[in-house]
Each structure stands twice: as C-alpha cells, then as structure tokens.
C-alpha cells in the first residue's frame, strides 16, 4: 500500500505472524509509530512498535499468538495501519486491507543436516517452520550451494517443484568444502515471496580415495 | 448525546492563576482526547494544546508551554486547564473541546460553552 | 507555526446568495501521509464554534449540503450555495497538518 511517498508492505507466515516494513521519503526523526492490525471477523487485536532498519524505513513483527497457532485463514481480512504519534494523539500514516493468504513469506527452512556424505555427492534434509497445515503439498523449494570462490549471488538456483524436505547434491569436488542454503515458497497467494533463505549449512565432501578412481 | 460542561465565569488578579474544568458526558472519557482553545474578545482561535485522559499525556503548544497545565480525572470525566502567572492578555473565553486519539479525520468534534477569564486588579 | 490567512474579514451577503470564503496557509498543508487536514468551523453569536467541512472538502455529519469545500496545497475555498439565517456568524478555517495546528483569523458572515 502506498500512500503519497510511503509504503508498506506486510507478509504474513502462514501461523502467528506478520511482518511488516514501512518506509517514508523525508521521515519522521524521533516520532514513536506503531502498527496495529485489526482483524474483521477476530475478537483480538495486535500492536508492534516500528524500529528503524535504515534511514528512511522501520518494521516490526505483529505476534499473534503461539508461533505454530493458526491465527489466521484464508477468508480472513486484516486492515493494518501505520500510525505516528503526533502530539498526544496517533496520525494514520498508511493503510491496507491485508488478505493473509494472499501475502504470504513462510519462515527460513530449520534443522539443515547432512544425512549422507560422500566424495562427489551429498544428501541434506531440513524441515519447513510454521508453515501452516492448509498449504498440505503445495509448496516449493529453492537451494543453492556456494562453491570455494564463488559467492551466493553466482550460485546456480536447483528449483524443486514439490514439497520435498531433501536434496541430493551431485557432481561435488572430493575434500572440498561448501555451504548450502534452502528457501521455500507456497503456491498460493498473489503477492506470496520466497522465505527468507535458512542459515548455511558447512559441509565437506569426502576426499577421493588414493589411487582409485571413484 | 456527548457533551461539555465547562466551568464558570473568572474574575483574577495579574499574576494570580486560575483553573477552569471541563465535564464530558455521553461518551468514554479515555477514549478521546481533550484539546483546549483560547478566543480573546473580537480575535481568533487559537489552539493551546490537548491531553489525552487514557495516560495523561499532554503537548502544548510553545507558546503556552510553562504557564498551561493540563490535567485529567477518569473519575469524575472531568479534564482541567490551570492557567498561571496571568497579565491582561489572558482575559478571554477558553474553550474545551473533544478530539479523536487518533487524527484520522478532523481535529475537534464537539465543544464546550467556553469559559470567560477576565484578568483585572 | 503555519500561518493561516482568511478573506474577507467581512462578507455582506443578502439571503439566499452564495458566499465564498477563502484561507490560504503559509505553507504546504499537505501532511506527510498524503492528506490534508484543512477542517472549516463556524462559531455563531454567543455560541461554540461548531465543525462543518474535514479534509478539505467532506462534511461533518448533520452539516446541510449547501456548505461545500475546496482547495489544495494552500489556497482553499469554503462556500455556501443558498445562504439561510441561520449560517451567519464566524467562520474559521484551521489546519491540523503541521503542529502546533492552528486558525485563521475569522470571516465574519453578515447580512447585507
């Protein structure tokens, strides 16, 4: 939602919260904002207090309950404003009615571990976090893996198209070592983005047995 | 139906102070916020600085800062403006005035009759 | 502050005319969430003022259709189509963009 040079944008993760970041040309210095969700057929109500993560934006997080409790459905609309305190009063600085399911960024895959490691390939596992029962399948997957003297942004993107909770990575250099990162989408919603990536996953490829070819 | 119920009339000496209330009836008295006008005899408005019941927390206009206190009780719903160190230029009709806590639409909705002060040795 | 700047001071009018009362600011009242909180008040004789136009141009609730208001950035328009009896008195305009919010200096609507 944009209001004149502001915008807002909010994502919710499918369980117990949303997300939302606000920026404004030419800001506010030392005003305190808040944003407040209300929900249009939930008895509750939620606040968070925007901090600032650069010059000119600040975000917060909505908690809505428990972090696997499903606060929220499809048919639900959430209208979310900014608002500023101006004087002893609160001045609405953006607006939008939030459709959850529409908007939807699930939290970074957890517990990455390598199941099987060998010379030239290696099985890693993770597990999806809060992500909500409706989804059943219909999510899916990006990895990447840094290789020695690439960076992130060069790594190839493996794209899995299904709900899958592991990966088999091959053509791998013996005794070398790599990182890898996983991030998952669901197939629902128009203004649904991928999870932020998890954390790295360091391993190292077995070294090649000395002369023997494998 | 939402009222304000302003004290009366004032008669004070220069320097004396005087506190003036105002009772709101017909709606929740923390859920709103109390701004207070000033309107000198034949001149304008001009807006002091409001309180808001819920906390207690004011803003004043600079140019009232440090001789308006601004003051509320969720009692008897009533908000209250002590005017101190008083000279001539203060004598006029102060009025109080309902505000949303949030400003999404307009400032005031519903005023006060106004209370006349009238500063005279 | 924004200085808020009212003409006429005086607008005879005969009943039934229109009356066209104008406010310009000091500066821009656009606020920095887009809106422009230019509100009009009319105070009659012996009464409290009383709030008729919000955001430039919307009329507060019971404020007949004849009073209208316009404007932009800084120069805005409050205007009354048919004038009856009862809408003499003072009229101010007020600005809540920027604070310390503040009024104009009055038009005072009187009968020709």
């Known amino acids: 939602a944009v209001n004149g040079t502001s915008q807002f944008t909010c994502f919710y993760n499918s369980r117990a919260n949303i997300s939302c970041v606000w920026s404004q040309d030419g800001a506010l210095q030392d005003t305190s904002c808040q944003v407040h969700a209300w929900p249009d057929r939930r008895r509750w109500n939620q606040t968070c207090e925007l901090l600032p993560v650069s010059q000119a934006s600040w975000a917060c997080n909505l908690i809505l309950g428990a972090p696997d409790s499903q606060k929220l459905t499809t048919v639900d609309i959430v209208t979310l404003r900014v608002l500023c305190r101006e004087g002893v009063r609160w001045r609405v600085m953006a607006i939008q009615d939030f459709k959850p399911f529409e908007n939807l960024r699930l939290m970074a895959p957890i517990s990455l571990q390598v199941v099987h490691v060998e010379t030239h390939r290696c099985n890693i596992s993770w597990e999806i976090s809060q992500a909500s029962h409706y989804f059943e399948r219909h999510l899916e997957f990006e990895a990447r893996t840094l290789s020695p003297g690439h960076t992130w942004e060069e790594a190839p993107l493996l794209t899995l198209k299904q709900k899958q909770e592991w990966i088999c990575l091959e053509t791998l250099t013996p005794d070398t070592q790599y990182e890898f990162q996983v991030r998952v989408k669901p197939l629902q919603g128009e203004f649904t983005t991928w999870s932020p990536w998890s954390q790295p996953l360091a391993f190292r490829t077995k070294p090649a047995a000395l002369g023997k070819d494998t | 139906q939402v009222q304000l119920q302003q004290s009366g009339p004032e008669l004070v000496k220069p320097g004396a102070s005087v506190k003036m209330s105002c009772k709101a009836s017909?709606?929740?008295?923390?859920?709103?916020?109390i701004s207070w006008v000033k309107q000198r005899s034949g001149q304008g408005l001009e807006w002091i600085g409001e309180?808001?019941?819920?906390?207690?927390?004011?803003y004043y206009n600079e140019m009232f800062k440090g001789r308006a206190t601004l003051t509320a009780d969720k009692s008897p719903n009533t908000a209250y403006m002590k005017l101190s160190s008083l000279t001539s230029e203060d004598s006029a009709l102060y009025f109080c005035?309902?505000?949303?806590?949030?400003?999404?639409?307009?400032?005031?909705?519903?005023w006060g009759q106004g209370t006349s002060v009238t500063v005279s040795s | 502050d924004v200085l808020m700047t009212q003409t006429p001071l005086s607008l005879p009018v005969s009943l039934g005319d229109q009356a066209s009362i104008s406010c310009r600011s000091s500066?821009?009242?656009?606020?920095?969430?887009?809106?422009?909180?230019l509100e009009w008040y009319l105070q009659k004789p012996g009464q409290s003022p009383k709030l008729l136009i919000y955001?430039?141009?919307n009329r507060f609730s019971g404020v007949p259709d004849r009073f209208s208001g316009s404007g932009s950035g800084t120069d805005f328009t409050l205007k009354i189509s048919r004038v009856e009896a009862e809408d003499l008195g003072l009229y101010y305009c007020?600005?809540?963009?920027?604070?310390?919010?503040?009024f104009g200096g009055g038009t005072k609507l009187e009968i020709k």
């Open positions: 005035a309902r505000g949303s806590y949030t400003y999404d639409n307009y400032a005031m909705d519903f």
């Open positions: 017909g709606y929740r008295f923390s859920d709103y916020v």
């Open positions: 309180i808001y019941p819920g906390d207690a927390q004011t």
């Open positions: 500066q821009n009242i656009v606020h920095s969430n887009a809106n422009t909180y």
């Open positions: 955001k430039v141009s």
């Open positions: 007020f600005q809540g963009s920027h604070i310390p919010w503040t």
